[in-house]
Protein backbone atom coordinates (compact mmCIF):
# COMPACT_ATOMS: atom_id res chain seq x y z
CA UNK A 1 0.00 0.00 0.00
CA UNK A 2 2.64 2.50 1.04
CA UNK A 3 4.79 1.72 -1.98
CA UNK A 4 1.85 2.26 -4.29
CA UNK A 5 1.12 5.60 -2.64
CA UNK A 6 4.76 6.58 -2.91
CA UNK A 7 4.77 5.62 -6.56
CA UNK A 8 1.60 7.66 -7.23
CA UNK A 9 2.94 10.66 -5.33
CA UNK A 10 6.26 10.49 -7.16
CA UNK A 11 4.38 10.44 -10.47
CA UNK A 12 2.03 13.29 -9.54
CA UNK A 13 4.60 15.72 -8.18
CA UNK A 14 6.74 15.69 -11.34
CA UNK A 15 6.64 19.06 -13.08
CA UNK A 16 5.36 18.01 -16.48
CA UNK A 17 2.13 18.31 -18.43
CA UNK A 18 -0.64 16.16 -17.01
CA UNK A 19 0.35 16.02 -13.32
CA UNK A 20 -1.52 17.59 -10.40
CA UNK A 21 1.67 19.41 -9.42
CA UNK A 22 2.21 20.91 -12.88
CA UNK A 23 -1.31 22.34 -13.17
CA UNK A 24 -1.04 24.14 -9.83
CA UNK A 25 2.57 25.08 -10.45
CA UNK A 26 1.96 26.89 -13.75
CA UNK A 27 -0.82 28.99 -12.24
CA UNK A 28 -1.36 28.86 -8.50
CA UNK A 29 -4.88 27.89 -7.50
CA UNK A 30 -4.41 29.72 -4.23
CA UNK A 31 -5.34 33.37 -3.89
CA UNK A 32 -2.23 35.22 -2.79
CA UNK A 33 -2.46 38.62 -1.12
CA UNK A 34 0.25 41.07 -0.26
CA UNK A 35 -0.61 43.42 2.59
CA UNK A 36 1.45 46.55 3.15
CA UNK A 37 1.87 48.61 6.30
CA UNK A 38 3.54 51.96 5.69
CA UNK A 39 5.63 53.62 8.40
CA UNK A 40 4.33 57.19 8.53
CA UNK A 41 6.98 59.50 10.02
CA UNK A 42 5.50 61.74 12.71
CA UNK A 43 8.41 64.12 13.38
CA UNK A 44 10.28 64.82 10.12
CA UNK A 45 11.50 68.30 11.10
CA UNK A 46 12.89 67.23 14.48
CA UNK A 47 14.81 64.40 12.85
CA UNK A 48 16.26 66.62 10.14
CA UNK A 49 17.14 69.52 12.45
CA UNK A 50 18.12 67.74 15.68
CA UNK A 51 18.87 64.16 14.67
CA UNK A 52 16.06 63.01 16.98
CA UNK A 53 14.76 59.47 17.07
CA UNK A 54 12.40 58.85 14.17
CA UNK A 55 8.83 58.43 15.42
CA UNK A 56 6.87 56.12 13.15
CA UNK A 57 3.26 55.03 13.11
CA UNK A 58 2.34 52.08 10.93
CA UNK A 59 -0.70 52.50 8.68
CA UNK A 60 -2.29 49.55 6.96
CA UNK A 61 -3.09 47.04 5.74
CA UNK A 62 -3.22 48.12 2.12
CA UNK A 63 -3.88 44.91 0.26
CA UNK A 64 -3.04 43.78 -3.26
CA UNK A 65 -3.80 40.55 -5.03
CA UNK A 66 -0.54 39.13 -6.40
CA UNK A 67 0.78 35.99 -8.13
CA UNK A 68 -2.40 35.58 -10.15
CA UNK A 69 -0.56 35.36 -13.47
CA UNK A 70 0.50 32.06 -14.97
CA UNK A 71 4.18 31.31 -15.44
CA UNK A 72 5.42 32.31 -18.89
CA UNK A 73 7.81 30.77 -21.42
CA UNK A 74 7.50 27.38 -19.73
CA UNK A 75 10.06 25.22 -21.52
CA UNK A 76 10.94 21.62 -20.73
CA UNK A 77 14.49 20.41 -21.32
CA UNK A 78 14.39 16.63 -21.66
CA UNK A 79 18.16 16.42 -21.73
CA UNK A 80 18.82 17.72 -18.23
CA UNK A 81 15.30 17.13 -16.84
CA UNK A 82 14.63 20.77 -16.09
CA UNK A 83 11.84 23.19 -16.82
CA UNK A 84 12.48 26.91 -17.25
CA UNK A 85 10.02 29.77 -16.83
CA UNK A 86 9.44 33.41 -16.05
CA UNK A 87 7.26 34.41 -13.11
CA UNK A 88 5.30 37.52 -14.22
CA UNK A 89 4.61 40.24 -11.68
CA UNK A 90 1.23 41.81 -11.22
CA UNK A 91 -0.60 43.56 -8.40
CA UNK A 92 -4.27 44.53 -8.16
CA UNK A 93 -5.40 46.79 -5.35
CA UNK A 94 -8.16 45.35 -3.14
CA UNK A 95 -10.06 48.27 -1.58
CA UNK A 96 -12.33 46.01 0.48
CA UNK A 97 -9.30 44.48 2.21
CA UNK A 98 -7.59 47.83 2.80
CA UNK A 99 -7.88 50.62 5.35
CA UNK A 100 -7.78 53.33 2.72
CA UNK A 101 -7.04 54.05 -0.93
CA UNK A 102 -3.92 54.13 -3.08
CA UNK A 103 -4.19 57.92 -2.91
CA UNK A 104 -3.55 58.02 0.85
CA UNK A 105 -0.58 60.23 1.77
CA UNK A 106 2.42 59.24 3.89
CA UNK A 107 5.44 61.09 5.21
CA UNK A 108 8.42 58.90 4.37
CA UNK A 109 12.14 59.21 3.85
CA UNK A 110 13.06 60.85 0.55
CA UNK A 111 14.24 57.76 -1.31
CA UNK A 112 16.20 59.65 -3.96
CA UNK A 113 18.01 61.91 -1.51
CA UNK A 114 18.99 58.99 0.75
CA UNK A 115 20.09 56.82 -2.17
CA UNK A 116 21.99 59.50 -4.10
CA UNK A 117 23.93 60.63 -1.04
CA UNK A 118 24.93 57.01 -0.42
CA UNK A 119 25.85 56.14 -4.01
CA UNK A 120 27.82 59.34 -4.63
CA UNK A 121 30.22 59.69 -1.72
CA UNK A 122 32.58 62.15 -3.40
CA UNK A 123 32.13 65.46 -1.59
CA UNK A 124 32.18 67.58 -4.73
CA UNK A 125 29.49 65.41 -6.30
CA UNK A 126 27.51 65.72 -3.07
CA UNK A 127 27.76 69.49 -3.41
CA UNK A 128 26.33 69.23 -6.91
CA UNK A 129 23.54 67.02 -5.55
CA UNK A 130 22.94 69.52 -2.76
CA UNK A 131 22.35 72.36 -5.20
CA UNK A 132 19.89 70.17 -7.15
CA UNK A 133 18.13 69.06 -3.95
CA UNK A 134 17.73 72.70 -2.93
CA UNK A 135 16.65 73.78 -6.41
CA UNK A 136 13.97 71.07 -6.52
CA UNK A 137 12.80 72.00 -2.99
CA UNK A 138 13.41 68.41 -1.90
CA UNK A 139 14.15 67.49 1.69
CA UNK A 140 15.13 64.54 3.88
CA UNK A 141 11.49 63.48 4.07
CA UNK A 142 8.72 63.71 1.52
CA UNK A 143 4.97 63.22 1.31
CA UNK A 144 3.94 60.54 -1.18
CA UNK A 145 0.79 58.60 -1.97
CA UNK A 146 0.75 54.85 -1.50
CA UNK A 147 0.64 54.36 -5.26
CA UNK A 148 3.68 56.58 -5.76
CA UNK A 149 5.67 55.02 -2.96
CA UNK A 150 5.11 51.44 -4.12
CA UNK A 151 4.89 51.67 -7.88
CA UNK A 152 6.86 54.78 -8.75
CA UNK A 153 6.85 58.55 -9.21
CA UNK A 154 8.96 61.06 -11.09
CA UNK A 155 11.40 62.49 -8.59
CA UNK A 156 11.85 66.29 -8.85
CA UNK A 157 15.47 66.22 -7.67
CA UNK A 158 16.57 63.43 -10.00
CA UNK A 159 14.78 65.18 -12.86
CA UNK A 160 17.30 68.03 -12.53
CA UNK A 161 20.38 65.78 -12.80
CA UNK A 162 21.98 66.90 -16.07
CA UNK A 163 23.14 63.45 -17.15
CA UNK A 164 21.17 60.25 -17.80
CA UNK A 165 19.73 58.76 -14.61
CA UNK A 166 16.46 56.94 -13.93
CA UNK A 167 14.19 59.71 -12.71
CA UNK A 168 11.36 57.39 -11.65
CA UNK A 169 11.62 56.11 -8.10
CA UNK A 170 9.46 53.59 -6.23
CA UNK A 171 10.09 50.77 -3.79
CA UNK A 172 8.76 48.19 -6.25
CA UNK A 173 9.32 50.11 -9.47
CA UNK A 174 9.11 48.65 -12.06
CA UNK A 175 6.62 45.92 -11.12
CA UNK A 176 3.53 45.46 -13.31
CA UNK A 177 4.43 44.10 -16.75
CA UNK A 178 7.76 42.76 -15.49
CA UNK A 179 8.79 39.20 -14.68
CA UNK A 180 11.13 37.49 -12.25
CA UNK A 181 13.57 34.99 -13.71
CA UNK A 182 14.40 33.13 -15.88
CA UNK A 183 14.22 30.28 -13.37
CA UNK A 184 15.35 26.82 -14.43
CA UNK A 185 14.23 24.12 -11.99
CA UNK A 186 14.49 20.36 -11.92
CA UNK A 187 11.26 18.71 -13.04
CA UNK A 188 11.92 15.55 -10.97
CA UNK A 189 11.52 13.14 -13.87
CA UNK A 190 14.82 11.41 -13.29
CA UNK A 191 15.12 12.09 -9.56
CA UNK A 192 12.04 13.06 -7.56
CA UNK A 193 14.18 14.25 -4.64
CA UNK A 194 15.29 17.17 -6.83
CA UNK A 195 11.85 18.28 -8.00
CA UNK A 196 11.34 22.08 -7.96
CA UNK A 197 14.92 22.66 -6.83
CA UNK A 198 16.40 25.61 -8.70
CA UNK A 199 19.19 24.71 -11.09
CA UNK A 200 19.86 28.25 -12.35
CA UNK A 201 18.43 31.74 -11.87
CA UNK A 202 18.94 34.27 -14.66
CA UNK A 203 21.21 31.72 -16.28
CA UNK A 204 23.55 31.38 -13.32
CA UNK A 205 24.04 29.09 -10.32
CA UNK A 206 25.28 32.00 -8.22
CA UNK A 207 23.94 35.47 -7.52
CA UNK A 208 27.15 37.57 -7.65
CA UNK A 209 25.92 39.61 -4.68
CA UNK A 210 27.68 37.79 -1.86
CA UNK A 211 30.93 36.05 -1.08
CA UNK A 212 31.38 32.29 -0.65
CA UNK A 213 28.39 30.04 0.18
CA UNK A 214 26.12 33.04 0.81
CA UNK A 215 26.03 33.59 -2.94
CA UNK A 216 24.57 30.17 -3.73
CA UNK A 217 21.06 29.64 -5.07
CA UNK A 218 19.79 26.88 -2.79
CA UNK A 219 16.61 24.84 -2.78
CA UNK A 220 13.26 25.71 -4.34
CA UNK A 221 11.26 28.94 -4.56
CA UNK A 222 9.32 27.80 -1.42
CA UNK A 223 6.07 27.13 -3.32
CA UNK A 224 6.84 23.43 -3.03
CA UNK A 225 9.59 21.10 -1.90
CA UNK A 226 10.56 17.57 -2.90
CA UNK A 227 8.03 15.06 -1.48
CA UNK A 228 8.22 13.10 1.77
CA UNK A 229 9.35 16.00 3.92
CA UNK A 230 10.80 15.03 7.30
CA UNK A 231 10.54 17.13 10.44
CA UNK A 232 14.29 16.94 10.86
CA UNK A 233 14.94 18.55 7.49
CA UNK A 234 16.23 22.06 6.99
CA UNK A 235 14.28 23.40 4.03
CA UNK A 236 16.36 25.63 1.81
CA UNK A 237 14.75 28.10 -0.55
CA UNK A 238 15.67 31.12 -2.64
CA UNK A 239 13.81 34.43 -2.46
CA UNK A 240 14.55 37.00 -5.13
CA UNK A 241 12.83 39.64 -2.95
CA UNK A 242 15.66 39.43 -0.44
CA UNK A 243 18.37 38.56 -2.98
CA UNK A 244 19.48 35.47 -1.11
CA UNK A 245 18.79 31.85 -0.22
CA UNK A 246 17.49 31.19 3.26
CA UNK A 247 16.12 28.24 5.23
CA UNK A 248 13.24 27.13 7.42
CA UNK A 249 13.13 24.61 10.27
CA UNK A 250 10.25 22.56 11.65
CA UNK A 251 8.28 24.20 14.42
CA UNK A 252 5.00 22.35 14.94
CA UNK A 253 2.26 20.10 13.56
CA UNK A 254 -0.71 22.10 12.29
CA UNK A 255 -4.11 20.99 11.06
CA UNK A 256 -5.04 23.01 7.99
CA UNK A 257 -8.63 22.44 6.87
CA UNK A 258 -8.38 18.83 7.94
CA UNK A 259 -4.99 18.32 6.32
CA UNK A 260 -2.03 17.54 8.60
CA UNK A 261 0.79 19.94 7.70
CA UNK A 262 4.22 20.73 9.09
CA UNK A 263 4.81 24.35 10.05
CA UNK A 264 8.32 25.40 9.11
CA UNK A 265 9.57 28.78 10.30
CA UNK A 266 12.54 31.03 9.56
CA UNK A 267 14.55 30.80 12.76
CA UNK A 268 16.14 33.78 14.46
CA UNK A 269 19.50 32.08 13.82
CA UNK A 270 19.08 32.82 10.11
CA UNK A 271 19.22 36.54 10.96
CA UNK A 272 21.97 36.32 13.57
CA UNK A 273 25.32 38.05 13.37
CA UNK A 274 28.41 36.02 12.44
CA UNK A 275 29.36 36.21 16.12
CA UNK A 276 26.40 33.97 16.95
CA UNK A 277 26.09 32.16 13.62
CA UNK A 278 29.47 31.93 11.85
CA UNK A 279 27.76 30.76 8.64
CA UNK A 280 26.40 34.30 8.24
CA UNK A 281 29.84 35.92 7.91
CA UNK A 282 29.41 36.38 4.19
CA UNK A 283 26.15 38.29 4.60
CA UNK A 284 28.09 40.99 6.43
CA UNK A 285 29.31 43.18 3.57
CA UNK A 286 30.67 46.23 5.37
CA UNK A 287 32.08 47.03 8.79
CA UNK A 288 30.73 50.47 9.75
CA UNK A 289 26.93 50.15 9.70
CA UNK A 290 27.19 46.57 10.96
CA UNK A 291 29.44 47.68 13.83
CA UNK A 292 32.14 45.25 12.78
CA UNK A 293 29.58 42.56 11.92
CA UNK A 294 28.10 42.51 15.42
CA UNK A 295 24.72 44.01 14.43
CA UNK A 296 22.08 41.52 13.36
CA UNK A 297 18.62 41.25 11.90
CA UNK A 298 19.19 43.52 8.91
CA UNK A 299 20.52 42.50 5.51
CA UNK A 300 22.30 45.00 3.28
CA UNK A 301 21.08 44.20 -0.25
CA UNK A 302 22.52 47.32 -1.89
CA UNK A 303 24.60 45.22 -4.29
CA UNK A 304 21.37 43.74 -5.60
CA UNK A 305 19.70 47.17 -5.86
CA UNK A 306 22.18 49.09 -8.05
CA UNK A 307 23.96 50.47 -5.00
CA UNK A 308 20.85 51.93 -3.38
CA UNK A 309 21.19 51.43 0.39
CA UNK A 310 18.28 49.03 0.84
CA UNK A 311 18.24 46.92 3.99
CA UNK A 312 15.85 44.01 4.45
CA UNK A 313 14.68 42.92 7.88
CA UNK A 314 11.74 41.25 9.51
CA UNK A 315 8.81 43.58 10.34
CA UNK A 316 9.36 45.94 13.25
CA UNK A 317 12.98 44.74 13.35
CA UNK A 318 11.99 41.38 14.82
CA UNK A 319 15.14 39.38 15.67
CA UNK A 320 17.29 42.50 15.11
CA UNK A 321 19.93 43.89 17.46
CA UNK A 322 18.95 46.78 19.77
CA UNK A 323 21.30 49.23 18.03
CA UNK A 324 19.26 48.86 14.82
CA UNK A 325 15.90 49.78 16.33
CA UNK A 326 17.24 52.22 18.95
CA UNK A 327 16.89 55.35 16.73
CA UNK A 328 13.31 54.41 15.77
CA UNK A 329 10.33 54.94 18.08
CA UNK A 330 6.99 53.22 17.57
CA UNK A 331 8.05 49.68 16.72
CA UNK A 332 6.52 46.64 18.45
CA UNK A 333 7.95 43.39 17.14
CA UNK A 334 6.19 40.13 17.93
CA UNK A 335 6.78 36.66 16.51
CA UNK A 336 3.16 35.77 15.82
CA UNK A 337 2.58 38.76 13.54
CA UNK A 338 6.03 39.34 12.12
CA UNK A 339 7.79 36.04 11.47
CA UNK A 340 7.66 34.03 8.25
CA UNK A 341 6.25 30.53 8.13
CA UNK A 342 5.45 27.83 5.57
CA UNK A 343 2.82 25.14 6.15
CA UNK A 344 3.94 22.15 4.14
CA UNK A 345 2.00 19.00 3.41
CA UNK A 346 4.78 16.49 4.03
CA UNK A 347 3.78 13.74 1.58
CA UNK A 348 3.64 15.93 -1.53
CA UNK A 349 5.96 18.69 -0.30
CA UNK A 350 3.40 21.29 -1.38
CA UNK A 351 3.21 24.55 0.57
CA UNK A 352 -0.50 24.78 1.34
CA UNK A 353 -0.33 27.92 3.45
CA UNK A 354 2.33 30.52 3.98
CA UNK A 355 2.98 33.96 5.42
CA UNK A 356 6.05 35.70 4.08
CA UNK A 357 6.84 38.81 6.08
CA UNK A 358 9.57 41.30 5.42
CA UNK A 359 10.39 44.94 5.95
CA UNK A 360 12.01 47.34 3.52
CA UNK A 361 14.38 49.86 5.10
CA UNK A 362 16.66 52.51 3.67
CA UNK A 363 19.91 53.69 5.15
CA UNK A 364 20.39 57.43 5.51
CA UNK A 365 23.69 58.87 6.66
CA UNK A 366 24.87 62.31 7.69
CA UNK A 367 26.42 64.30 4.86
CA UNK A 368 28.60 67.34 5.35
CA UNK A 369 27.79 68.69 1.92
CA UNK A 370 24.07 67.94 1.66
CA UNK A 371 22.20 70.56 3.62
CA UNK A 372 19.14 68.45 4.45
CA UNK A 373 21.38 65.70 5.92
CA UNK A 374 23.92 67.99 7.50
CA UNK A 375 22.46 68.04 11.00
CA UNK A 376 22.25 64.27 11.35
CA UNK A 377 24.56 62.98 14.05
CA UNK A 378 24.14 59.25 13.32
CA UNK A 379 23.19 56.70 10.70
CA UNK A 380 19.58 55.57 10.53
CA UNK A 381 18.21 52.40 9.00
CA UNK A 382 14.80 53.85 8.30
CA UNK A 383 11.78 51.51 8.04
CA UNK A 384 9.67 52.44 5.02
CA UNK A 385 7.12 49.62 5.00
CA UNK A 386 6.56 46.02 5.91
CA UNK A 387 4.61 43.44 3.98
CA UNK A 388 2.77 40.24 4.66
CA UNK A 389 2.32 38.00 1.63
CA UNK A 390 -0.10 35.19 2.39
CA UNK A 391 -1.75 32.31 0.63
CA UNK A 392 -3.98 29.51 1.90
CA UNK A 393 -5.30 26.52 0.00
CA UNK A 394 -8.97 27.05 -0.94
CA UNK A 395 -11.76 24.92 0.57
CA UNK A 396 -12.43 23.12 -2.70
CA UNK A 397 -8.76 22.31 -3.25
CA UNK A 398 -8.45 21.23 0.38
CA UNK A 399 -11.33 18.77 -0.06
CA UNK A 400 -9.70 17.40 -3.18
CA UNK A 401 -6.38 17.14 -1.36
CA UNK A 402 -7.96 15.33 1.59
CA UNK A 403 -9.72 12.82 -0.59
CA UNK A 404 -6.90 12.20 -3.03
CA UNK A 405 -3.81 12.43 -0.83
CA UNK A 406 -4.14 12.47 2.95
CA UNK A 407 -7.37 10.48 2.99
CA UNK A 408 -5.78 7.65 1.04
CA UNK A 409 -2.83 7.49 3.40
CA UNK A 410 -4.90 7.57 6.58
Amino acid sequence: GDLLIQKTIKKQVVLEEGTIAFKNWVKTGTEVYRQFWIFDVQNPQEVMMNSSNIQVKQRGPYTYRVRFLAKENVTQDAEDNTVSFLQPNGAIFEPSLSVGTEADNFTVLNLAVAAASHIYQNQFVQMILNSLINKSKSSMFQVRTLRELLWGYRDPFLSLVPYPVTTTVGLFYPYNNTADGVYKVFNGKDNISKVAIIDTYKGKRNLSYWESHCDMINGTDAASFPPFVEKSQVLQFFSSDICRSIYAVFESDVNLKGIPVYRFVLPSKAFASPVENPDNYCFCTEKIISKNCTSYGVLDISKCKEGRPVYISLPHFLYASPDVSEPIDGLNPNEEEHRTYLDIEPITGFTLQFAKRLQVNLLVKPSEKIQVLKNLKRNYIVPILWLNETGTIGDEKANMFRSQVTGKIN
Epitope: Y120, N122, Q123, F124, V125, M127, I128, N130, S131, P162, Y163, E368, K369, Q371, K374
Partner: antibody, heavy 115, light 107 residues
Protein backbone atom coordinates in the same frame (compact mmCIF):
# COMPACT_ATOMS: atom_id res chain seq x y z
CA UNK B 1 54.37 62.22 -6.95
CA UNK B 2 51.15 64.04 -7.95
CA UNK B 3 51.60 66.27 -10.98
CA UNK B 4 49.24 68.35 -13.08
CA UNK B 5 50.78 69.51 -16.35
CA UNK B 6 48.90 72.06 -18.41
CA UNK B 7 49.10 72.95 -22.10
CA UNK B 8 51.05 75.99 -23.25
CA UNK B 9 50.14 79.66 -23.52
CA UNK B 10 47.58 80.74 -26.14
CA UNK B 11 46.83 83.99 -27.94
CA UNK B 12 43.23 84.18 -29.18
CA UNK B 13 41.02 86.57 -31.08
CA UNK B 14 37.83 87.91 -29.47
CA UNK B 15 34.83 85.69 -30.25
CA UNK B 16 36.96 82.56 -30.67
CA UNK B 17 37.39 79.60 -28.28
CA UNK B 18 40.29 78.18 -26.33
CA UNK B 19 40.76 74.67 -24.99
CA UNK B 20 43.24 74.14 -22.18
CA UNK B 21 44.35 70.64 -21.21
CA UNK B 22 45.57 69.34 -17.86
CA UNK B 23 47.31 65.97 -17.72
CA UNK B 24 47.34 64.29 -14.32
CA UNK B 25 49.82 61.73 -13.04
CA UNK B 26 50.88 60.18 -9.73
CA UNK B 27 47.37 59.19 -8.64
CA UNK B 28 44.24 57.45 -9.97
CA UNK B 29 42.65 60.15 -12.13
CA UNK B 30 39.03 59.16 -11.52
CA UNK B 31 39.43 59.21 -7.72
CA UNK B 32 39.34 63.01 -7.49
CA UNK B 33 37.51 65.82 -9.18
CA UNK B 34 39.34 68.47 -11.18
CA UNK B 35 38.58 72.11 -10.54
CA UNK B 36 39.40 75.10 -12.74
CA UNK B 37 40.37 78.52 -11.40
CA UNK B 38 41.40 81.62 -13.27
CA UNK B 39 43.38 84.71 -12.31
CA UNK B 40 43.30 87.89 -14.35
CA UNK B 41 46.50 89.98 -14.34
CA UNK B 42 46.94 91.59 -10.91
CA UNK B 43 43.62 90.19 -9.72
CA UNK B 44 42.43 87.56 -7.27
CA UNK B 45 41.40 83.96 -7.81
CA UNK B 46 38.07 83.00 -9.37
CA UNK B 47 36.52 79.51 -9.40
CA UNK B 48 35.12 78.55 -12.80
CA UNK B 49 33.85 75.03 -12.28
CA UNK B 50 34.73 71.43 -11.56
CA UNK B 51 34.28 67.96 -12.98
CA UNK B 52 34.25 64.54 -11.35
CA UNK B 53 35.74 62.10 -13.89
CA UNK B 54 34.17 59.08 -12.18
CA UNK B 55 30.51 60.12 -12.42
CA UNK B 56 30.72 62.86 -15.03
CA UNK B 57 29.26 65.27 -12.45
CA UNK B 58 29.95 68.89 -13.40
CA UNK B 59 29.33 72.23 -11.72
CA UNK B 60 29.96 75.65 -13.22
CA UNK B 61 30.06 79.11 -11.66
CA UNK B 62 26.99 81.07 -12.83
CA UNK B 63 29.24 83.65 -14.48
CA UNK B 64 30.65 81.08 -16.91
CA UNK B 65 27.51 78.97 -17.47
CA UNK B 66 26.96 78.47 -21.19
CA UNK B 67 30.47 79.60 -22.13
CA UNK B 68 32.64 77.04 -20.41
CA UNK B 69 32.72 73.28 -21.05
CA UNK B 70 34.60 70.91 -18.80
CA UNK B 71 35.44 67.39 -19.94
CA UNK B 72 37.62 64.57 -18.68
CA UNK B 73 39.22 61.70 -20.55
CA UNK B 74 39.84 58.82 -18.15
CA UNK B 75 41.86 56.87 -20.73
CA UNK B 76 44.52 59.58 -20.88
CA UNK B 77 44.01 61.02 -17.37
CA UNK B 78 43.45 64.42 -18.91
CA UNK B 79 40.95 67.14 -18.04
CA UNK B 80 39.96 69.88 -20.45
CA UNK B 81 38.50 73.34 -20.06
CA UNK B 82 37.04 75.03 -23.13
CA UNK B 83 35.99 78.67 -22.99
CA UNK B 84 34.05 80.10 -25.92
CA UNK B 85 33.02 83.58 -27.10
CA UNK B 86 36.26 84.99 -25.75
CA UNK B 87 36.53 88.66 -24.86
CA UNK B 88 39.46 90.76 -23.75
CA UNK B 89 38.47 90.42 -20.07
CA UNK B 90 39.05 86.66 -20.35
CA UNK B 91 42.78 87.34 -20.54
CA UNK B 92 44.06 85.44 -17.51
CA UNK B 93 46.11 82.55 -16.20
CA UNK B 94 43.93 79.44 -16.10
CA UNK B 95 44.74 76.77 -13.51
CA UNK B 96 43.56 73.22 -13.08
CA UNK B 97 43.61 72.11 -9.47
CA UNK B 98 42.71 68.84 -7.78
CA UNK B 99 39.97 68.10 -5.26
CA UNK B 100 37.68 70.32 -3.25
CA UNK B 101 40.52 71.79 -1.22
CA UNK B 102 42.68 72.49 -4.32
CA UNK B 103 45.58 70.49 -2.91
CA UNK B 104 47.66 70.30 -6.11
CA UNK B 105 47.78 72.85 -8.92
CA UNK B 106 48.91 72.89 -12.52
CA UNK B 107 51.57 75.42 -13.50
CA UNK B 108 48.93 77.62 -15.17
CA UNK B 109 48.16 78.47 -18.79
CA UNK B 110 48.19 82.10 -19.89
CA UNK B 111 45.41 82.86 -22.34
CA UNK B 112 45.66 86.27 -24.00
CA UNK B 113 42.61 87.57 -25.86
CA UNK B 114 43.55 90.34 -28.23
CA UNK B 115 42.52 91.58 -31.64
CA UNK C 1 25.96 82.07 -3.05
CA UNK C 2 28.29 82.43 -0.08
CA UNK C 3 30.33 85.61 -0.29
CA UNK C 4 33.69 85.71 1.47
CA UNK C 5 35.00 89.02 2.81
CA UNK C 6 38.74 88.97 3.44
CA UNK C 7 40.63 91.64 5.31
CA UNK C 8 42.94 93.43 5.29
CA UNK C 9 43.74 93.73 1.59
CA UNK C 10 47.31 94.70 2.42
CA UNK C 11 49.54 94.39 5.44
CA UNK C 12 53.15 95.01 6.30
CA UNK C 13 55.10 93.16 8.97
CA UNK C 14 58.59 92.69 10.29
CA UNK C 15 60.29 89.31 10.62
CA UNK C 16 59.41 87.76 13.95
CA UNK C 17 56.00 89.46 14.03
CA UNK C 18 52.65 87.76 14.29
CA UNK C 19 49.96 88.59 11.73
CA UNK C 20 46.31 87.60 11.39
CA UNK C 21 44.03 87.65 8.37
CA UNK C 22 40.26 87.48 8.70
CA UNK C 23 37.66 85.92 6.41
CA UNK C 24 33.97 86.35 7.11
CA UNK C 25 31.36 84.38 5.18
CA UNK C 26 27.77 85.39 4.44
CA UNK C 27 26.46 81.92 5.39
CA UNK C 28 27.38 79.30 7.97
CA UNK C 29 30.01 77.05 6.39
CA UNK C 30 30.90 74.90 9.44
CA UNK C 31 34.72 74.59 9.32
CA UNK C 32 35.01 74.33 5.53
CA UNK C 33 37.61 77.06 5.05
CA UNK C 34 40.93 76.64 3.26
CA UNK C 35 43.96 78.94 3.13
CA UNK C 36 46.46 79.45 0.31
CA UNK C 37 49.74 81.23 -0.28
CA UNK C 38 50.69 82.56 -3.71
CA UNK C 39 54.03 83.97 -4.72
CA UNK C 40 54.56 85.93 -7.96
CA UNK C 41 54.64 83.77 -11.09
CA UNK C 42 53.60 80.64 -9.18
CA UNK C 43 50.30 78.81 -8.68
CA UNK C 44 48.73 79.08 -5.23
CA UNK C 45 49.81 76.56 -2.59
CA UNK C 46 47.44 74.99 -0.08
CA UNK C 47 48.58 75.67 3.48
CA UNK C 48 45.55 74.75 5.59
CA UNK C 49 42.52 72.73 4.53
CA UNK C 50 39.01 72.23 5.99
CA UNK C 51 38.91 71.81 9.73
CA UNK C 52 42.09 73.89 10.25
CA UNK C 53 44.23 70.98 9.05
CA UNK C 54 47.83 71.96 8.41
CA UNK C 55 49.09 70.39 5.20
CA UNK C 56 52.14 68.09 5.37
CA UNK C 57 55.38 70.03 4.92
CA UNK C 58 53.81 73.36 5.89
CA UNK C 59 55.66 75.04 8.81
CA UNK C 60 53.79 75.04 12.13
CA UNK C 61 53.98 78.83 12.38
CA UNK C 62 50.94 78.84 10.08
CA UNK C 63 47.61 78.13 11.78
CA UNK C 64 43.93 78.90 11.48
CA UNK C 65 40.78 78.85 13.56
CA UNK C 66 37.11 79.54 13.21
CA UNK C 67 33.74 77.94 12.68
CA UNK C 68 30.47 79.05 11.14
CA UNK C 69 31.07 82.47 9.62
CA UNK C 70 34.23 83.89 11.26
CA UNK C 71 37.67 82.58 10.36
CA UNK C 72 41.19 83.67 11.22
CA UNK C 73 44.50 82.78 9.64
CA UNK C 74 47.63 83.39 11.72
CA UNK C 75 51.34 83.47 10.95
CA UNK C 76 53.51 83.44 14.05
CA UNK C 77 57.13 84.47 14.02
CA UNK C 78 57.07 85.72 10.42
CA UNK C 79 60.00 84.97 8.13
CA UNK C 80 61.02 86.87 5.02
CA UNK C 81 59.96 84.00 2.76
CA UNK C 82 56.37 84.51 3.93
CA UNK C 83 56.01 87.58 1.73
CA UNK C 84 53.17 86.60 -0.62
CA UNK C 85 49.47 86.90 -1.35
CA UNK C 86 47.16 84.89 0.93
CA UNK C 87 43.68 83.73 -0.04
CA UNK C 88 40.86 81.98 1.79
CA UNK C 89 38.39 79.70 0.02
CA UNK C 90 35.07 78.34 1.31
CA UNK C 91 34.43 74.76 0.19
CA UNK C 92 31.12 74.23 1.95
CA UNK C 93 28.78 74.90 -0.96
CA UNK C 94 28.62 75.78 -4.63
CA UNK C 95 29.81 78.01 -6.11
CA UNK C 96 33.17 77.78 -4.38
CA UNK C 97 34.20 81.31 -3.47
CA UNK C 98 37.52 82.97 -2.62
CA UNK C 99 38.29 85.93 -0.45
CA UNK C 100 39.72 88.94 -2.32
CA UNK C 101 43.23 88.21 -1.11
CA UNK C 102 45.72 89.82 1.30
CA UNK C 103 49.11 91.05 0.20
CA UNK C 104 51.68 90.50 2.96
CA UNK C 105 54.84 92.60 2.68
CA UNK C 106 57.87 91.99 4.90
CA UNK C 107 59.73 95.13 5.85
Amino acid sequence: EVQLVQSGAEVKKPGSSVKVSCKASGYRFSDYEMQWVRQAPGQGLEWMGGIDPETGGIAYAQKFQGRVTLTADKSTSTAYMELSSLRSEDTAVYYCTRKLDFDYWGQGTLVTVSS
Amino acid sequence: ETTVTQSPAFMSATTGDKVTISCITSTDIDDDMNWYQQKPGEPPKLLISEGSTLRPGVPSRFSSSGYGTDFTFTINNIESEDAAYYYCLQSDNLPLTFGQGTKLEIK
